[in-house]
Protein backbone atom coordinates (compact mmCIF):
# COMPACT_ATOMS: atom_id res chain seq x y z
CA UNK A 1 0.00 0.00 0.00
CA UNK A 2 1.35 3.43 -0.80
CA UNK A 3 2.20 5.42 2.31
CA UNK A 4 -0.36 8.09 3.14
CA UNK A 5 1.04 11.60 2.59
CA UNK A 6 -0.20 15.17 2.58
CA UNK A 7 1.32 18.39 1.28
CA UNK A 8 1.81 21.23 3.72
CA UNK A 9 3.86 24.24 4.70
CA UNK A 10 5.13 24.96 8.22
CA UNK A 11 5.51 28.27 10.03
CA UNK A 12 7.08 28.70 13.44
CA UNK A 13 5.12 30.30 16.29
CA UNK A 14 6.52 33.70 15.33
CA UNK A 15 5.08 33.23 11.84
CA UNK A 16 8.45 32.73 10.17
CA UNK A 17 8.29 30.60 7.00
CA UNK A 18 10.79 27.97 5.95
CA UNK A 19 12.74 28.39 2.72
CA UNK A 20 15.65 26.67 1.04
CA UNK A 21 19.09 28.07 1.83
CA UNK A 22 21.44 26.36 -0.57
CA UNK A 23 20.88 22.78 -1.70
CA UNK A 24 20.84 21.05 1.72
CA UNK A 25 19.67 23.59 4.29
CA UNK A 26 16.48 25.30 5.39
CA UNK A 27 16.25 28.72 6.98
CA UNK A 28 13.42 30.55 8.70
CA UNK A 29 12.38 34.10 7.90
CA UNK A 30 9.31 36.32 7.68
CA UNK A 31 7.77 36.35 4.22
CA UNK A 32 4.99 38.47 2.80
CA UNK A 33 3.00 38.73 -0.40
CA UNK A 34 4.51 37.10 -3.44
CA UNK A 35 7.60 36.09 -1.48
CA UNK A 36 5.40 33.46 0.22
CA UNK A 37 5.88 31.38 -2.92
CA UNK A 38 9.48 30.79 -1.81
CA UNK A 39 8.44 28.73 1.20
CA UNK A 40 9.11 25.02 0.98
CA UNK A 41 6.21 22.62 0.58
CA UNK A 42 6.64 19.45 2.59
CA UNK A 43 5.25 16.05 1.76
CA UNK A 44 4.42 14.76 5.23
CA UNK A 45 4.18 10.96 5.21
CA UNK A 46 2.52 8.96 7.99
CA UNK A 47 4.94 6.15 8.77
CA UNK A 48 5.58 3.40 11.28
CA UNK A 49 7.19 4.57 14.49
CA UNK A 50 6.82 4.54 18.24
CA UNK A 51 3.31 5.92 18.02
CA UNK A 52 1.53 6.90 21.21
CA UNK A 53 -1.83 8.45 22.02
CA UNK A 54 -0.31 11.90 21.57
CA UNK A 55 2.58 11.34 19.17
CA UNK A 56 2.14 10.55 15.48
CA UNK A 57 5.24 9.38 13.57
CA UNK A 58 5.84 11.23 10.31
CA UNK A 59 8.56 11.74 7.73
CA UNK A 60 9.11 15.19 6.22
CA UNK A 61 10.12 15.18 2.59
CA UNK A 62 10.38 18.18 0.30
CA UNK A 63 7.60 17.98 -2.25
CA UNK A 64 8.77 16.71 -5.64
CA UNK A 65 12.37 16.55 -4.44
CA UNK A 66 14.20 13.46 -3.26
CA UNK A 67 15.18 15.19 -0.03
CA UNK A 68 14.08 14.28 3.50
CA UNK A 69 14.78 15.87 6.83
CA UNK A 70 16.89 13.46 8.85
CA UNK A 71 18.62 13.42 12.23
CA UNK A 72 22.21 12.24 12.58
CA UNK A 73 25.15 12.66 14.93
CA UNK A 74 27.70 15.17 13.71
CA UNK A 75 30.67 15.79 15.98
CA UNK A 76 28.76 13.91 18.69
CA UNK A 77 25.78 16.28 18.46
CA UNK A 78 22.30 15.44 17.15
CA UNK A 79 21.99 17.40 13.92
CA UNK A 80 19.23 18.12 11.43
CA UNK A 81 20.07 17.69 7.78
CA UNK A 82 18.45 17.36 4.39
CA UNK A 83 19.32 13.95 3.04
CA UNK A 84 19.06 12.84 -0.55
CA UNK A 85 17.29 9.50 -1.15
CA UNK A 86 16.51 7.23 -4.06
CA UNK A 87 13.09 8.44 -5.30
CA UNK A 88 12.23 4.90 -6.42
CA UNK A 89 12.24 3.72 -2.78
CA UNK A 90 10.86 6.74 -0.93
CA UNK A 91 8.57 7.60 0.69
CA UNK A 92 7.85 4.26 2.32
CA UNK A 93 5.82 3.13 5.31
CA UNK A 94 8.87 1.74 7.09
CA UNK A 95 11.27 4.64 7.10
CA UNK A 96 14.66 4.40 8.78
CA UNK A 97 14.60 5.88 12.26
CA UNK A 98 16.69 8.93 11.37
CA UNK A 99 13.91 10.14 9.03
CA UNK A 100 11.11 9.81 11.58
CA UNK A 101 9.70 12.63 13.69
CA UNK A 102 7.04 12.39 16.35
CA UNK A 103 4.41 15.00 15.52
CA UNK A 104 3.02 16.28 18.81
CA UNK A 105 0.00 18.57 18.94
CA UNK A 106 -0.29 20.86 21.97
CA UNK A 107 -2.71 23.80 22.11
CA UNK A 108 -3.13 23.90 18.32
CA UNK A 109 0.64 24.06 17.88
CA UNK A 110 2.86 21.29 16.53
CA UNK A 111 6.21 20.05 17.75
CA UNK A 112 8.40 17.66 15.78
CA UNK A 113 10.51 15.46 18.06
CA UNK A 114 13.28 13.37 16.54
CA UNK A 115 12.56 9.64 16.89
CA UNK A 116 16.30 8.97 16.76
CA UNK A 117 17.08 11.52 19.49
CA UNK A 118 14.22 11.82 21.99
CA UNK A 119 13.71 15.33 23.42
CA UNK A 120 15.42 16.93 20.43
CA UNK A 121 13.12 19.02 18.28
CA UNK A 122 13.02 20.75 14.93
CA UNK A 123 13.80 24.32 15.96
CA UNK A 124 14.21 27.84 14.65
CA UNK A 125 16.06 30.82 16.11
CA UNK A 126 14.45 34.05 17.25
CA UNK A 127 16.69 35.81 14.75
CA UNK A 128 15.74 36.21 11.11
CA UNK A 129 17.30 34.22 8.28
CA UNK A 130 18.93 31.59 10.46
CA UNK A 131 19.13 27.83 9.72
CA UNK A 132 16.44 25.42 10.88
CA UNK A 133 18.15 23.06 13.31
CA UNK A 134 17.70 20.27 15.84
CA UNK A 135 17.49 21.71 19.34
CA UNK A 136 17.70 19.94 22.67
CA UNK A 137 15.66 22.45 24.68
CA UNK A 138 11.99 23.40 24.78
CA UNK A 139 10.58 26.57 26.25
CA UNK A 140 13.85 28.48 25.97
CA UNK A 141 14.99 31.10 23.48
CA UNK A 142 14.71 28.82 20.48
CA UNK A 143 11.34 28.09 18.88
CA UNK A 144 10.01 24.53 18.72
CA UNK A 145 6.32 25.27 18.03
CA UNK A 146 4.92 25.30 14.50
CA UNK A 147 1.64 25.62 12.68
CA UNK A 148 0.83 23.59 9.58
CA UNK A 149 -0.94 24.88 6.49
CA UNK A 150 -2.41 22.32 4.10
CA UNK A 151 -1.50 22.68 0.44
CA UNK A 152 -3.67 21.12 -2.24
CA UNK A 153 -1.98 18.50 -4.39
Amino acid sequence: APVRSLNCTLRDSQQKSLVMSGPYELKALHLQGQDMEQQVVFSMSFVQGEESNDKIPVALGLKEKNLYLSCVLKDDKPTLQLESVDPKNYPKKKMEKRFVFNKIEINNKLEFESAQFPNWYISTSQAENMPVFLGGTKGGQDITDFTMQFVSS
Epitope: A1, Q48, G49, E50, E51, S52, N53, D54, K55, K93, K94, M95, E96, K97, P118
Partner: antibody, heavy 122, light 107 residues
Framework: EVQLQESGPGLVKPSETLSLTCTVS????????VSWIRQPPGKGLEWIGL???????YYNSPLKSRLTISKDNSKSQVSLKLSSVTAADTAVYYC????????????????WGQGTLVTVSS | DIQMTQSPSSLSASVGDRVTITCQTS??????LNWYQQKPGKAPKLLIS???NLRPGVPSRFSGSGSGTDFTFTISSLQPEDFATYYC?????????FGQGTKLEIK
Protein backbone atom coordinates in the same frame (compact mmCIF):
# COMPACT_ATOMS: atom_id res chain seq x y z
CA GLU B 1 17.29 -15.73 27.17
CA VAL B 2 14.25 -13.46 26.85
CA GLN B 3 11.63 -14.04 29.54
CA LEU B 4 8.51 -12.23 30.74
CA GLN B 5 6.52 -13.09 33.86
CA GLU B 6 3.16 -11.59 34.86
CA SER B 7 2.15 -11.37 38.51
CA GLY B 8 -0.66 -9.89 40.56
CA PRO B 9 -3.81 -10.76 42.47
CA GLY B 10 -5.97 -13.43 40.89
CA LEU B 11 -9.19 -11.98 42.30
CA VAL B 12 -10.39 -8.37 42.10
CA LYS B 13 -13.71 -6.98 43.28
CA PRO B 14 -16.03 -5.11 40.87
CA SER B 15 -15.38 -1.32 40.70
CA GLU B 16 -11.85 -1.78 42.09
CA THR B 17 -8.55 -1.42 40.23
CA LEU B 18 -6.79 -4.39 38.67
CA SER B 19 -2.99 -4.12 39.08
CA LEU B 20 -0.50 -6.40 37.37
CA THR B 21 3.26 -6.44 37.02
CA CYS B 22 5.34 -7.84 34.16
CA THR B 23 8.93 -8.62 35.15
CA VAL B 24 11.29 -9.11 32.22
CA SER B 25 14.78 -10.50 31.73
CA UNK B 26 17.07 -10.97 28.75
CA UNK B 27 16.40 -7.50 27.33
CA UNK B 28 16.29 -3.89 28.47
CA UNK B 29 13.00 -2.04 28.86
CA UNK B 30 14.73 1.12 27.65
CA UNK B 31 15.34 -0.54 24.26
CA UNK B 32 12.11 -2.47 23.65
CA UNK B 33 8.41 -1.83 23.99
CA VAL B 34 6.11 -4.11 25.97
CA SER B 35 2.47 -4.80 25.13
CA TRP B 36 -0.38 -6.09 27.27
CA ILE B 37 -2.91 -8.51 25.78
CA ARG B 38 -5.87 -10.21 27.42
CA GLN B 39 -7.98 -13.27 26.71
CA PRO B 40 -11.36 -13.84 28.38
CA PRO B 41 -11.99 -17.53 29.24
CA GLY B 42 -12.71 -19.51 26.07
CA LYS B 43 -12.42 -16.41 23.85
CA GLY B 44 -9.93 -14.75 21.53
CA LEU B 45 -7.06 -12.32 22.10
CA GLU B 46 -7.52 -8.59 22.65
CA TRP B 47 -4.61 -6.14 22.47
CA ILE B 48 -4.80 -3.68 25.37
CA GLY B 49 -1.92 -1.27 24.76
CA LEU B 50 1.82 -0.83 25.06
CA UNK B 51 4.64 1.19 26.52
CA UNK B 52 7.63 2.01 24.32
CA UNK B 53 11.29 2.04 25.35
CA UNK B 54 11.19 5.80 25.76
CA UNK B 55 8.15 5.60 28.03
CA UNK B 56 5.43 6.78 25.65
CA UNK B 57 2.20 4.79 25.78
CA TYR B 58 -0.53 3.80 23.34
CA TYR B 59 -3.84 2.64 24.81
CA ASN B 60 -6.49 0.83 22.82
CA SER B 61 -9.60 3.03 22.59
CA PRO B 62 -12.15 0.79 24.37
CA LEU B 63 -10.03 0.75 27.55
CA LYS B 64 -8.25 4.10 27.25
CA SER B 65 -10.18 5.95 29.98
CA ARG B 66 -9.53 3.21 32.56
CA LEU B 67 -6.00 2.17 31.64
CA THR B 68 -2.54 3.14 32.87
CA ILE B 69 0.66 1.41 31.72
CA SER B 70 3.93 2.45 33.33
CA LYS B 71 7.36 0.98 33.92
CA ASP B 72 10.50 1.03 36.03
CA ASN B 73 13.50 0.34 33.80
CA SER B 74 15.84 -0.23 36.73
CA LYS B 75 13.58 -2.95 38.14
CA SER B 76 12.83 -4.38 34.66
CA GLN B 77 9.14 -4.13 35.45
CA VAL B 78 6.10 -2.94 33.51
CA SER B 79 2.84 -2.38 35.32
CA LEU B 80 -0.75 -2.36 34.15
CA LYS B 81 -3.58 -0.71 36.07
CA LEU B 82 -7.19 -1.03 34.95
CA SER B 83 -9.72 0.89 37.04
CA SER B 84 -13.43 0.38 37.66
CA VAL B 85 -13.35 -3.28 36.64
CA THR B 86 -16.42 -5.38 35.93
CA ALA B 87 -16.95 -9.09 35.26
CA ALA B 88 -16.22 -8.35 31.59
CA ASP B 89 -12.58 -7.70 32.55
CA THR B 90 -12.15 -11.31 33.75
CA ALA B 91 -9.39 -12.74 31.55
CA VAL B 92 -5.91 -14.15 31.31
CA TYR B 93 -3.59 -11.14 31.00
CA TYR B 94 -0.35 -11.46 29.03
CA CYS B 95 2.61 -9.15 28.56
CA UNK B 96 4.71 -9.46 25.41
CA UNK B 97 7.90 -7.93 24.04
CA UNK B 98 7.80 -5.82 20.88
CA UNK B 99 10.31 -6.67 18.15
CA UNK B 100 11.20 -2.96 17.74
CA UNK B 101 13.05 -3.56 14.46
CA UNK B 102 12.94 -0.13 12.84
CA UNK B 103 12.25 0.03 9.11
CA UNK B 104 11.53 -3.69 9.14
CA UNK B 105 9.23 -5.08 11.84
CA UNK B 106 8.44 -2.57 14.55
CA UNK B 107 5.06 -3.70 15.87
CA UNK B 108 5.23 -7.50 16.09
CA UNK B 109 5.30 -9.23 19.48
CA UNK B 110 7.90 -11.96 19.57
CA UNK B 111 8.06 -13.19 23.19
CA TRP B 112 5.16 -13.58 25.60
CA GLY B 113 4.77 -14.23 29.31
CA GLN B 114 2.83 -17.31 30.41
CA GLY B 115 -0.16 -15.16 31.44
CA THR B 116 -2.02 -14.66 34.69
CA LEU B 117 -5.73 -15.22 35.24
CA VAL B 118 -7.60 -12.34 36.85
CA THR B 119 -11.18 -12.96 37.97
CA VAL B 120 -13.45 -10.04 38.76
CA SER B 121 -15.99 -11.13 41.33
CA SER B 122 -17.38 -10.02 44.66
CA ASP C 1 -8.95 0.27 13.38
CA ILE C 2 -8.12 -2.60 11.04
CA GLN C 3 -10.69 -5.38 11.15
CA MET C 4 -9.54 -8.99 10.86
CA THR C 5 -11.61 -11.83 9.42
CA GLN C 6 -10.11 -15.26 10.08
CA SER C 7 -11.62 -18.45 8.73
CA PRO C 8 -12.61 -21.10 9.45
CA SER C 9 -13.32 -20.64 13.16
CA SER C 10 -12.79 -24.37 13.70
CA LEU C 11 -11.39 -27.21 11.66
CA SER C 12 -11.23 -30.98 12.08
CA ALA C 13 -8.33 -32.77 10.44
CA SER C 14 -6.20 -35.89 10.72
CA VAL C 15 -2.48 -36.40 11.23
CA GLY C 16 -0.76 -36.06 7.86
CA ASP C 17 -3.42 -33.73 6.40
CA ARG C 18 -2.64 -30.46 4.70
CA VAL C 19 -4.46 -27.60 6.44
CA THR C 20 -5.05 -24.02 5.32
CA ILE C 21 -6.31 -21.06 7.35
CA THR C 22 -7.05 -17.66 5.84
CA CYS C 23 -7.02 -14.14 7.24
CA GLN C 24 -8.50 -11.10 5.54
CA THR C 25 -7.90 -7.52 6.63
CA SER C 26 -10.16 -4.51 6.15
CA UNK C 27 -7.25 -2.39 4.86
CA UNK C 28 -4.10 -3.02 2.87
CA UNK C 29 -1.35 -3.95 5.35
CA UNK C 30 1.38 -4.92 2.87
CA UNK C 31 3.00 -7.98 4.50
CA UNK C 32 2.60 -6.94 8.13
CA LEU C 33 0.80 -10.06 9.29
CA ASN C 34 1.86 -12.60 11.92
CA TRP C 35 0.61 -16.08 12.79
CA TYR C 36 0.55 -17.42 16.36
CA GLN C 37 -0.08 -20.87 17.78
CA GLN C 38 -1.74 -21.24 21.17
CA LYS C 39 -2.10 -24.47 23.10
CA PRO C 40 -4.55 -24.78 26.03
CA GLY C 41 -3.28 -23.03 29.15
CA LYS C 42 -0.23 -21.66 27.32
CA ALA C 43 0.80 -18.29 25.86
CA PRO C 44 0.62 -17.71 22.11
CA LYS C 45 3.84 -18.55 20.25
CA LEU C 46 4.95 -16.59 17.19
CA LEU C 47 5.35 -18.94 14.22
CA ILE C 48 5.45 -16.61 11.22
CA SER C 49 6.15 -12.89 10.97
CA UNK C 50 5.82 -10.52 8.03
CA UNK C 51 3.37 -12.88 6.26
CA UNK C 52 5.94 -15.54 5.30
CA ASN C 53 9.00 -15.40 7.56
CA LEU C 54 9.35 -18.59 9.57
CA ARG C 55 10.65 -17.86 13.05
CA PRO C 56 13.82 -19.64 14.20
CA GLY C 57 13.13 -23.14 15.49
CA VAL C 58 9.69 -23.40 13.88
CA PRO C 59 9.30 -26.55 11.72
CA SER C 60 9.25 -26.04 7.97
CA ARG C 61 5.84 -27.70 7.61
CA PHE C 62 4.43 -24.31 8.68
CA SER C 63 4.27 -21.64 6.00
CA GLY C 64 2.56 -18.35 5.30
CA SER C 65 1.85 -16.29 2.23
CA GLY C 66 -0.06 -13.27 1.05
CA SER C 67 0.11 -9.50 1.00
CA GLY C 68 -2.27 -6.58 0.94
CA THR C 69 -5.53 -7.84 2.42
CA ASP C 70 -5.46 -11.62 1.86
CA PHE C 71 -3.24 -14.01 3.76
CA THR C 72 -2.90 -17.78 4.07
CA PHE C 73 -1.35 -20.00 6.72
CA THR C 74 -0.60 -23.63 5.81
CA ILE C 75 0.51 -26.73 7.66
CA SER C 76 1.73 -29.11 4.98
CA SER C 77 1.47 -32.33 6.99
CA LEU C 78 -0.26 -32.18 10.35
CA GLN C 79 1.58 -33.61 13.34
CA PRO C 80 -0.06 -34.56 16.66
CA GLU C 81 1.52 -31.56 18.40
CA ASP C 82 -0.05 -29.13 15.88
CA PHE C 83 -3.57 -29.45 17.28
CA ALA C 84 -4.06 -26.01 18.82
CA THR C 85 -5.71 -22.65 18.15
CA TYR C 86 -4.11 -20.35 15.57
CA TYR C 87 -4.43 -16.55 15.43
CA CYS C 88 -3.43 -13.96 12.87
CA UNK C 89 -2.31 -10.50 14.00
CA UNK C 90 -1.87 -7.37 11.90
CA UNK C 91 1.31 -5.48 12.82
CA UNK C 92 0.86 -2.71 10.26
CA UNK C 93 -0.42 -0.02 12.62
CA UNK C 94 -1.75 0.63 16.07
CA UNK C 95 -3.98 -0.52 17.58
CA UNK C 96 -2.83 -4.06 16.88
CA UNK C 97 -5.73 -6.37 16.06
CA PHE C 98 -6.10 -10.16 16.10
CA GLY C 99 -8.19 -12.52 14.04
CA GLN C 100 -10.91 -14.43 15.88
CA GLY C 101 -8.85 -17.63 15.96
CA THR C 102 -9.08 -21.05 14.32
CA LYS C 103 -9.35 -24.10 16.56
CA LEU C 104 -7.70 -27.07 14.93
CA GLU C 105 -9.09 -30.34 16.29
CA ILE C 106 -8.40 -34.02 15.70
CA LYS C 107 -10.92 -35.67 13.38
Amino acid sequence: EVQLQESGPGLVKPSETLSLTCTVSGFSLSDFGVSWIRQPPGKGLEWIGLIWGGGDTYYNSPLKSRLTISKDNSKSQVSLKLSSVTAADTAVYYCAKQTNLWAYDLYSMDYWGQGTLVTVSS
Amino acid sequence: DIQMTQSPSSLSASVGDRVTITCQTSQDIDEDLNWYQQKPGKAPKLLISLASNLRPGVPSRFSGSGSGTDFTFTISSLQPEDFATYYCLQSDRLPLTFGQGTKLEIK
